[in-house]
Amino acid sequence: APVRSLNCTLRDSQQKSLVMSGPYELKALHLQGQDMEQQVVFSMSFVQGEESNDKIPVALGLKEKNLYLSCVLKDDKPTLQLESVDPKNYPKKKMEKRFVFNKIEINNKLEFESAQFPNWYISTSQAENMPVFLGGTKGGQDITDFTMQFVSS
């Protein structure tokens, strides 16, 4: 079956937006006014994953780019990266596990847990202009809560 997708932007709980930082990295910073146009638009695809009452498996691609957030081991540490894919084959219903995040939503606040590395979350730093990364702690200094804004297709 063809995969269902929605376009959206994400901001962390401090209202930092996500923008490209070089070809294969995202960073989080506060944007205002016309600068908001810099923020990346994600195509959130609803994919197959493990059954759970409160977790929805999604893949996060960059709209109209053949790039997906993925989770891999680098130097033995779970790491977030932007991975280039063949646009003829993606998105698809059965995404490889490294591309899958469990969307956990409570009161319109979203967390994105790596399906490949349970208890590791898409995270931002408190500091401005720092890379978006995969963090292994929740509720600490680093930010794991996001809000989502729909974007027209």
Partner: antibody, heavy 120, light 107 residues
């Protein structure tokens, strides 16, 4: 609590159009798909299409493309479905329903239905 | 389009009986399967979504299960208010499609 309140019954002549409304309360309108379903007299349920008010994404059943036009007004939390070029076979009860934007929860809430009768 | 073949089309049973209604999908629907109850002149009422998750407020005598592309609604002990028509729905792929319905009547 969640409520979907639909407009009242309509009687229309063949060839006319009708616009059915579905006014929503009790949840964040922009985050739920509004689904439209029809049921002809004594028949089963048939899916027409859906709209996500948050970004105006619309998906139609091919069978109803050109027949149904689905819209939403986020200022009034109301969704609409307009049916054009009505024929007797469009006589049916039309329902709106909802599903969360991530498709997880099924068509949980339903409007009471709007009977559209097409008769000369 | 995905076909949802629902059986039986009608069923007579008594209060206290255990009844099962089946829907067979013509292809994989990734567990995007709901069950509805409808009484004459009323809107459908959602019972179950994602195969087996009970909608809030629905009695626990209703349950859902799956085996491959076969999906089953079970009512463990029929109550007088359960006599109605039941529909399944796949919402995995456009167009979403309903089963033809099963009319559950008092024996």
């Amino acid at each position: 609590q969640v409520q979907l309140v639909q407009s009242g019954a309509e009687v229309k002549k063949p060839g006319a159009s009708v616009k059915v409304s579905c006014k929503v309360s009790g949840y964040t309108f922009s985050r739920y798909w509004i689904e439209w379903v029809r049921q002809a007299p004594g028949k089963g349920l048939e899916w027409i299409g859906e709209i996500l008010p948050g970004n105006a994404n619309i998906n139609y059943n091919e069978k109803f493309k050109g027949k149904a036009t689905i819209t939403a007004d986020t200022s009034t939390d109301t969704a609409y479905m307009e049916l054009s070029s009505l024929r007797s076979e469009d006589t049916a009860v039309y329902y709106c329903s909802t599903i969360y934007y991530d498709y997880d929860q099924g068509f949980t809430y339903w409007g009471q239905g709007t009977l559209v009768t097409v008769s000369s | 389009d995905i076909q949802m073949t629902q059986s039986p089309s009608s069923l007579s049973a008594s209060v206290g009986d255990r009844v099962t209604i089946t829907c067979k999908a013509s292809q994989d629907i990734d567990r995007y399967l709901s069950w509805f109850q409808q009484k004459p002149g009323k809107a459908p009422k959602s019972l179950i979504y994602r195969v087996k998750r009970l909608v809030d407020g629905v009695p626990s005598r209703f349950s859902g299960s799956a085996s491959g592309t076969d999906y089953t609604l079970t009512i463990s002990s029929l109550q007088p208010e359960d006599f109605a028509t039941y529909y399944c729905l796949q919402y995995d792929e456009f167009p979403y499609t309903f089963g033809q319905g099963t009319k559950l009547e008092i024996k």
